[in-house]
């Protein structure tokens, strides 16, 4: 007996975008307060009714008089085939399901899209559809002329497909991949035919989880929000993916205007516990994450304002900021970092409600600092505020060194010419500007004959000429607050200088190694002196000073060149303030090869010798120690007389060669020669490093032996 | 067959706004992507705008977006670019496409020229 | 942007030669490149697209080749009917782009 309950009024309807099949339905004979559990077998067939390709049991509550909705979402578009979908139903008791007594089916019903789609000769579908990486899609076409051959295309290669009628042609495609934002192209055509018909398939990349979602207030007003989206899903076509913000204990939602970042009003009624579930979402699928937290563990403060210096002195300053205010009062801890030339030279912490203090002590006068403050929450740390920089410079002081000064003495015409250097001081020396150095010139035999000069900075030397007496000369920096403590230097007439041995140094590319032997009696230290450029007029005068217990120094210089001889004078310093010459020292920091030769003078020519000789050859301008010299003569002889031995040059011309090992013997006679002979002789100076150059040989033809002298 | 017929030509100032329309025969209209193609004075192609066969997205080229606008109507067959803020720049010959494959131009009109200039 | 480059601006050839015209894609376009002829009236034709797919109607003695960044376009026994520019056109990313033209002459 047929149940009574059968489903009745069942109408199809489509939805061609989301190939999906909607059913709606009622059930009869229903009282109008009955409510009744109940099964419906749904049947859905392909082409044919007999070609069933989906059943489901439905299971859902029935009221009288109810329309029953339900949904299915075809893999294969709509507009490929016809469906025929048809249903019966049962009352649904749980404890024996196999045991159900169905109504009869109803009949088919006929959903066909191709009635429909008008009288081109091609068609493709699904028309832009929207699908996920990795899915699988399923295309068709639809011919309207069975004749012709067609072939379907993914991205212009060819796809195979299965013909479902002489129309249609279906095509799976599995695990698709996202190929570019404007879609996948699929594309049919008829052979020999002169259309081409294509459809997009958009494929978005899937839609990730927000990552690093975090929020906080600045204001104790607004909540910011921040979260990393992702990768992009790639797509042009849709709306790209919308993030909603939704707080479970006030109940309040806002769709967020930003990919990455979302404000939300701090409620007045000081709600302190936030639940935030952050939801990104796309046409194709939803993904959230949630945080709680309280709203003072969130606190990011702004950056502290109006920074000022007050009661700035030589050492000291009290730096005083203000904060934002926080709600409630609370408490913040400001970092003060101080810098001194770039770097870090004191940090401290300070607890600020409102306002800022803090002392910095143990600066430097007249130097500039930069200080910078940032704050956070002091109980609850979450981040700290951007720095704000200010910077403030002390006040000068005078100078608290005495300059470093050195002379010069050069006796011209009875009288003596002193000129006075002295290097600048530092900056923690100088407190402030210098702005004029003064020099007292005392007479040591006429006490109250003093002389008083000023130079103007940023000069750093003077010329005094005196008479041939001692004299204490006294030099002192000064700037706007004071004077420094005074450089005392004693000159005499004679400085005697003269009577010190050279002694010769090896210079290494570390510099001059020196040393002296300590001076007994009273010393106040010693000074090495030497210039960085001995070849140039002004020769760059330079001195070291050093304690009365040093007796060695390295001298180095960036001015130090190779092939250059550096002079160095060490002098003593005694208790009354007079330098005395110690020692005398000479060497270079790199010997090189000598480069030119001695200009020989050829005398004394006669049938069997002449003499050369090469007097103005000055051998300190070389540029390495003359230890002696080369004397060769060519000869068509080719014989070498005894004192000389054979030598090959470089272009394997043979000579003989004379060796002087004396560098102040600069006159040499070649001897044992024949008369009316041709000679070639060349003169050239050797070191430890080498000779100097094979250049040109100077031609010489003897005279007979009856010739005049 | 395909006909495409661009119209509208016309000489404008700069910041001036001018519509070109295209008309379509011979095919079904509103099953077929639509693009509109230029070609400078110095006979350099470049893609302008794209709409799909429904209409409901398009593309625009950097050069011309926020100034010009591609619409369709596929009732009367008609494709249209509505053009603003025009620059001389913008001075070329106007072509309307027919697109069944996506960023490949199958049809083209004979152009519509556009000069834009003081 | 991707940029099309097409080195040979202008290309002369006699009747029946087989002439080959080249075009270099700044980045990777897979097989996404399409060509055109634009006779001296302005008239534009699509020839080839996905490289080497002859658009209806176009003669057998056009052909494509290439693939990623490297595409040519040969014709085989050239033909008056021939003399015209030829674009080169990426449609794989946004905005599409063209080549600057290669003019084919009559030598």
């Known amino acids: 007996e047929p149940l009574p309950w059968a489903p009745e009024s069942l109408k199809v309807s489509i939805n061609s975008t989301h190939q999906c099949l909607h059913l709606q339905w009622s059930v009869h004979n229903l009282a109008y307060h009955q409510e009744l559990k109940m099964v419906f077998q749904i049947e859905i067939s392909r082409i044919k009714t007999s070609n069933v390709i989906w059943v489901e049991n439905y299971s859902t509550t029935v009221k009288g008089n109810q329309l029953l909705h339900w949904s299915w979402e075809s893999q294969l578009p709509l507009e490929c085939a016809k469906h025929f979908i048809r249903m019966r139903s049962a009352v649904d008791d749980a404890t024996t399901p196999e045991q159900r007594f169905w109504s009869n089916w109803s009949s088919w019903e006929e959903v066909d899209v191709q009635n429909s789609l008008g009288h081109e000769p091609l068609f493709v579908f699904p028309k832009d559809k929207l699908v996920e990486e990795g899915s699988n899609v399923t295309i068709c076409y639809v011919s309207r002329s069975q004749q012709n051959n067609i072939s379907c295309y993914l991205e212009g290669v060819r796809m195979q497909g299965q013909q479902l009628d002489p129309n249609v042609s279906m095509f799976n495609l599995h695990n698709v991949a996202f190929i570019r934002e404007t879609g996948t192209n699929i594309y049919c055509k008829v052979d020999r035919g002169d259309d081409i018909k294509g459809i997009v398939l958009f494929v978005s990349k899937i839609l990730e989880e927000p990552k690093d979602f975090s929020c906080e207030t600045r204001d104790f007003q607004t909540l910011s929000c921040t979260w990393d989206p992702g990768r992009d899903t790639g797509l042009l076509k849709q709306l790209p993916q919308s993030y909603t913000l939704f707080e479970s204990f006030s109940g309040k939602k806002t769709l967020c205007k930003h990919k990455g970042w979302c404000n939300w009003q701090v409620a007045p009624e000081s709600q302190e516990m936030y639940n935030f579930t952050l939801t990104a979402e796309n046409y194709l699928r939803k993904r959230s994450v949630h945080i709680l937290f309280n709203l003072t563990h969130r606190v990011h403060p702004m950056a502290p304002f109006n920074v000022l210096f007050k009661d700035v002195s030589v050492t000291n300053a009290t730096m005083t900021w203000k904060v934002h205010s926080t709600g409630n009062y609370y408490t913040l801890l400001c970092q003060v970092e101080l810098y001194g030339e770039g770097k870090v030279i004191q940090k401290h912490n300070v607890s600020v409600k409102v306002n800022g203090e803090l002392v910095l002590s143990g600066l430097e006068p007249d130097t500039e600092y930069s200080a910078q403050v940032r704050c956070a929450n002091a109980n609850h740390f979450w981040k700290w505020s951007e720095w704000t920089r200010q910077n403030f410079t002390t006040v000068e002081a005078a100078p608290s060194e005495a300059p470093d000064v050195w002379r010069n003495v050069k006796s011209v015409q009875g009288y003596c010419v002193v000129t006075l250097f002295w290097k600048p001081l530092s900056r923690l020396q100088a407190n402030g500007e210098i702005l004029f150095y003064n020099i007292v010139v005392e007479d040591l035999d006429r006490p109250s004959g003093l002389q008083l000069l000023s130079v103007p900075a940023p000069a750093n030397r003077t010329e005094l000429t005196l008479d041939q007496r001692a004299y204490q000369i006294h030099v002192t920096a000064n700037n706007s607050v004071g004077t420094s403590p005074a450089s005392v230097l004693v000159v005499s007439g004679d400085p005697g200088d003269e009577e010190v041995e050279e002694e010769r140094v090896k210079g290494t590319e570390d510099g001059f190694s020196l040393s002296w032997k300590p001076q007994p009696g009273n010393i106040t230290g010693y000074i090495v002196e030497w210039c960085d450029r001995p070849r140039d007029p002004l020769c760059d005068l330079q001195w070291k000073h050093l304690g009365p217990n040093t007796t060695s120094t390295v001298i180095s210089s960036d001015a130090f060149r190779p092939g250059v001889r550096y002079n160095f004078r060490i002098y003593g310093i005694s208790t009354e303030m007079v330098p005395y010459l110690l020692e005398k020292k000479t060497g270079y920091s790199q010997e090189l090869a000598p480069s030119d030769n001695p200009r020989v003078v050829m005398s004394n020519l006669t049938s069997h010798s002449f003499t050369l000789s090469w007097k103005d050859y000055s051998t300190e301008s070389q540029p390495s120690f003359i230890r002696g010299y080369h004397v060769y003569l060519k000869s068509k002889a080719g014989q070498c007389h005894p004192g000389s031995e054979k030598a090959v040059l470089s272009d394997d011309s043979v000579c003989c060669k004379y060796k002087i090992d004396d560098p102040k013997q600069k006159m040499f006679v070649v001897g044992n020669l024949q008369p009316e002979s041709f000679y070639e002789f060349l003169v050239t100076p050797y070191s430890a490093v080498g000779e100097g150059p094979h250049g040109a040989f100077t031609k010489v033809t003897t005279p007979d032996e009856y010739s005049p002298m | 067959d395909v006909k495409l017929v661009e119209s509208g030509e016309g000489l404008v100032k700069p910041g001036g706004s001018l519509k070109l329309s295209c008309a379509a025969s011979g095919f079904t209209f509103s099953s077929y992507a639509m693009s509109w193609v230029r070609q400078t004075p110095e006979k350099r192609l470049e893609w302008v705008t794209y709409?799909?066969?429904?209409?409901?997205?398009?593309y625009y080229a950097d050069t011309v977006k926020g100034r010009f606008t591609i619409s369709r109507d596929n009732a009367r067959n008609t494709l249209y670019l509505q053009m603003s803020s025009l620059k001389s720049e913008d001075t070329a010959m106007y072509y309307c496409?027919?697109?069944?494959?996506?960023?490949?131009?199958?049809?083209w009109g004979q152009g519509t020229l556009v000069t834009v200039s003081a | 942007d991707i940029q099309m480059t097409q080195t040979t601006s202008s290309l002369s050839a006699s009747l029946g030669d087989r002439v080959t015209i080249s075009c270099r894609a700044s980045?990777?376009?897979?097989?996404?490149l399409n060509w055109y002829q634009q006779k001296p009236d302005g008239t534009v034709k699509l020839l080839i697209y996905?490289?080497?797919t002859l658009h209806s109607g176009v003669p057998s003695r056009f052909s494509g080749s290439g693939s990623g960044t490297d595409f040519s376009l040969t014709i085989s026994n050239l033909e008056q009917e021939d003399i015209a520019t030829y674009f080169c056109q990426q449609g794989h990313m946004l905005p599409w782009t063209f080549g600057g033209g290669t003019k084919l002459e009559i030598k």
């Open positions: 996905y490289t080497s």
């Open positions: 496409t027919r697109d069944p494959i996506t960023g490949t131009f199958a049809y």
């Open positions: 709409i799909s066969s429904g209409g409901d997205y398009f």
């Open positions: 980045q990777d376009i897979t097989n996404y």
